[in-house]
């Protein structure tokens, strides 16, 4: 084994290096000292380190470690943050388009419904957006509310456009009749199925991305223990105390120290792997009725079909509803 | 006799977007993200090695520091002696993860469970027999998916309608819905967000 080189007789090199860490030289001994008060860089002979220097090295070592960890995760963190933002914006744009397609369908096919239809469609898609962002809204309730709100307007503006204003007083009855008589056929149920499946998947996808960011942020800002700080100091800085400024830690030694410092963090590994594989599985299934883009952008068409269904059965419905909601008008058709 | 308007507004002509060479859809973007994420699948197990390779470590030098003394790089002491003599091993004993790490592990367990629950079983993208009561004529069949965008020739099947490089910007305002003869044209200013 090679003999250790003699310590710098004046601690000059150590002093100039330490000055970069801590301006002001009062902590560096002029010449090597016994160092009996040292707790980390335990000397085998005279040393150029003091207790205060050791504390400063520990602080610097932990800061270095935090910076290394942050730079290690920078690319991954950026990847998830950027994609979470992109997908959230894209989903909002899909919702906005879906709303506009639906409004356009009403404006061009059922202009007499538009003032109210725009309002109901707007409320529905606002709920869709809130649901995707994690709000505690029931999708079936959203769809039911849309059709419950639309039917009285369809009845009074489309099926019987010239009813007296008193017909508006039976809105509650019409809302009830909508479900009892299944006036839109199975279309509401169809929309519930498609919308709930596609939105659930979209919502969990966004939640997963946001959790990914949280995982990286957590490990990114870990505060390392004192034990770890001592290990890092010993590895990176104790050599300086002996005047060995240019020497580097051994590779195997570094790995052992890092595994010691990161024992807790590495425990995430198993769940992180599972997270990525589960997310991949989810993404592979996001098509057709599990793809909100596909479902929401096709909603205008299904809603249009549902209204045509009502119109097709208008005669039967009007008679039944006339009895069910028996409002005072004597209806005289020719 | 009832009259039904035949000039259904939203049809293939109006919503069709000019062909784009690079058609980047949401689903392709999702798959691309997964591929990139998979390259980080070993991120946490590889962290110690990554940090060592990005901090000063003796690579080409003959001598290296083992925490206590200068040793030859390939000697047993390079990894072991300094550790044994100075770490008293209590510093390395497993202390269990910090509370914040334990918390994040719990959250990962939870999301993983949710992701597994939500994942579509292979070969079963559609739920059959949505409703035992049959639709009346003109309604959709058992495949509820077939109903998407279905309304004869007047309607379009919406398939990956939103294209990042073309259609994200087609932001139809209710006040100026295009008429039947208008082509939906994208506006460039809304597209840049989605370039890598």
């Amino acid at each position: 084994q090679p003999p250790p080189p003699p310590p710098d007789a004046t601690c000059h090199q150590v002093r100039s290096f330490f000055q970069r860490l801590q301006p002001g030289l009062k902590w560096v001994p002029e010449t090597p000292v016994p160092g009996s008060d040292l707790q980390v860089c335990l000397p085998k002979g005279p040393t150029c380190c003091s207790r205060k220097m050791e504390e400063k090295y520990q602080l610097t070592a932990r800061l270095n470690m935090e910076q290394l960890l942050q730079s290690a995760s920078m690319e991954l963190k950026f990847l998830i943050i950027q994609n979470a933002a992109v997908f959230q914006e894209a989903f909002e744009i899909v919702v906005r388009h879906a709303k506009n397609y639906t409004n356009a369908m009403f404006k061009n096919n059922y202009p007499s419904l538009t003032p109210q239809a725009f309002e109901f469609v707007g409320e529905f898609f606002t709920d869709v957006s809130l649901y995707i962002l994690g709000s505690d809204i029931n999708v079936d309730d959203m769809v039911n509310e849309l059709f419950d709100s639309l039917f009285p307007v369809i009845y009074t503006q489309l099926m019987n456009p010239g009813l007296p204003d008193s017909a508006l007083d039976i809105n509650e009855c019409l809302r009830g009749a909508r479900r009892d008589l299944k006036v839109f056929g199975n279309f509401p149920k169809l929309i519930m199925t498609q919308v709930s499946k596609s939105l659930q998947v979209t919502r969990i996808f966004l939640q997963a991305l946001n959790l990914g960011i949280e995982v990286i942020n957590t490990t990114d800002h870990l505060k390392f223990s004192k034990d770890c700080g001592r290990m890092l100091t010993r590895m990176w800085y104790c050599s300086y105390c002996q005047g060995l400024m240019m020497v580097k830690p051994c590779g195997g030694y570094c790995n052992v120290v890092m595994q010691g410092c990161m024992a807790g963090v590495v425990e995430i590994d198993k769940y992180w792997r599972e997270y990525i594989l589960s997310l991949e599985e989810l993404v592979n299934g996001m098509y057709r009725i599990y793809d909100m883009e596909n479902v929401l952008l096709g909603l205008f068409s299904t809603i249009h079909d549902s209204i045509q269904y009502v119109q097709k059965n208008a005669g039967k419905l009007t008679t039944t509803i006339g009895k069910l909601c028996a409002h005072s008008q004597q209806r005289q058709y020719r | 006799s009832a009259y039904y308007p035949e000039d259904l507004f939203i049809d293939k002509k109006v919503l069709k977007v000019a062909h784009v060479e690079h058609e980047e859809t949401l689903s392709s973007r999702r798959r691309e993200l997964i591929q990139k994420l998979k390259s980080f699948i070993s991120f946490y197990s590889a962290l110690p090695g990554y940090i060592c390779s990005h901090s000063p470590v003796a690579e080409n030098d003959t001598l290296c520091w083992n925490g206590q003394e200068l040793v030859e790089r390939y000697s047993q002491k390079a990894a072991r002696n300094g550790m044994k003599n100075q770490f008293n091993l209590h510093e390395l004993k497993m202390k269990g993860p910090e509370p914040v790490v334990s918390q994040i592990i719990d959250k990962l367990k939870h999301i993983n469970q949710l992701l597994r629950t939500m994942s579509v079983p292979k070969g079963r993208v559609l739920d059959k027999n949505l409703d035992e009561e049959g639709f009346e004529s003109g309604d959709c069949g058992d495949d509820e998916d077939e109903c998407i965008g279905g309304s004869g020739d007047g309607m379009m099947k919406v398939k990956n309608q939103l294209r990042f490089l073309a259609e994200l910007a087609y932001d139809l305002d209710v006040d100026d819905v295009p008429g039947n003869n208008q082509q939906a044209t994208p506006k460039d200013n809304e597209i840049s967000t989605f370039h890598n």
């Epitope: 202009p111 007499s112 009074t156 503006q157 489309l158 099926m159 019987n160 456009p161 010239g162 009813l163 007296p164 204003d165 008193s166 017909a167 508006l168 208008a314 005072s328 008008q329 004597q330 005289q332 058709y333 020719r334 | 006799s1 009832a2 009259y3 308007p5």
Partner: antibody
Framework: QVQLHQSGAEMAKPGASVNLSCKTS????????ISWVKQRTRQGLEWIGD????????YYNEKFKDKATLTADRSSSTAYMELRSMTSEDSAVYFC?????????????WGQGTSLTVSS | DILLTQSPAILSVSPGERVSFSCRAS??????IHWYQQRTNGSPRLLIK???ESISGIPSRFGGSGSRTDFTLTINSVESEDIADYYC?????????FGGGTKLEIK
């Protein structure tokens, strides 16, 4: 701009029938209803009935249901009212007016009126 | 049928004065009342719809108020061109009915 143009003055004999027309322009005919209103000399206004051309929904005032028949021709955006079995009581000015749908039912545009005189 | 009673039958005011027309319904009709002006030998013209909603193109001096059974049309500052008959109409229930009208004269 919205216009409702009614056919010219009519003379009819008791027991005969007449057909009054109301040609519209400046709006989508099928999005509104057309109301018919009667006004006898120096008297008030009486609602006869409404027709909604899109689905041909027709509503009559009970009092006129055996007197008037409302029709509409979507191709020419014209509404018609046939009055039958004329008596002197039917001598009046008849107005057509545009009507919104339920909850929007004011008569916002009116024709110039058609004067009908029943005399033997 | 819902009966609409307008009072008085004739109103005589000086230019610049504020004038109010009354219309009373025989049963509650919410706000389903509309006001029309008919000048001599002319067609009726919509002034106010649904009790108080203004109509574009109608001077702002015309205003409406009321609900259920009692309704009022107000002209804030009468002008000579306002000489006409004024009718209220209900669209709450069939058959739609008009009031008997109020004649506005200028002193």
């Amino acid at each position: 701009q919205v216009q409702l143009h009614q056919s010219g003055a009519e003379m009819a004999k008791p027991g005969a029938s007449v057909n009054l027309s109301c040609k519209t322009s400046g709006f989508t005919f099928t999005d509104y209803g057309i109301s018919w209103v009667k006004q006898r000399t120096r008297q008030g206004l009486e609602w006869i009935g409404d027709i909604y051309p899109r689905h041909i929904n027709i509503y009559y005032n009970e009092k006129f249901k055996d007197k008037a028949t409302l029709t509409a021709d979507r191709s020419s955006s014209t509404a018609y009212m046939e009055l039958r079995s004329m008596t002197s009581e039917d001598s009046a000015v008849y107005f057509c007016a545009r009507r919104g749908t339920t909850g929007r039912g004011a008569l916002d545009y009116w024709g110039q009126g058609t004067s009908l005189t029943v005399s033997s | 049928d819902i009966l609409l009673t307008q009072s008085p039958a004739i109103l005589s005011v000086s230019p610049g004065e504020r004038v109010s027309f009354s219309c009373r319904a025989s049963q509650s009709i919410g706000t389903s009342i509309h006001w029309y002006q008919q000048r001599t030998n002319g067609s009726p013209r919509l002034l106010i719809k649904y009790a108080f909603e203004s109509i574009s193109g109608i001077p702002s001096r015309f205003g409406g108020s009321g609900s259920r059974t009692d309704f009022t049309l107000t002209i804030n500052s009468v002008e000579s061109e306002d000489i006409a008959d004024y009718y209220c109409q209900q669209t709450y229930n069939w058959p739609y009915t008009f009031g008997g009208g109020t004649k506005l004269e200028i002193k």
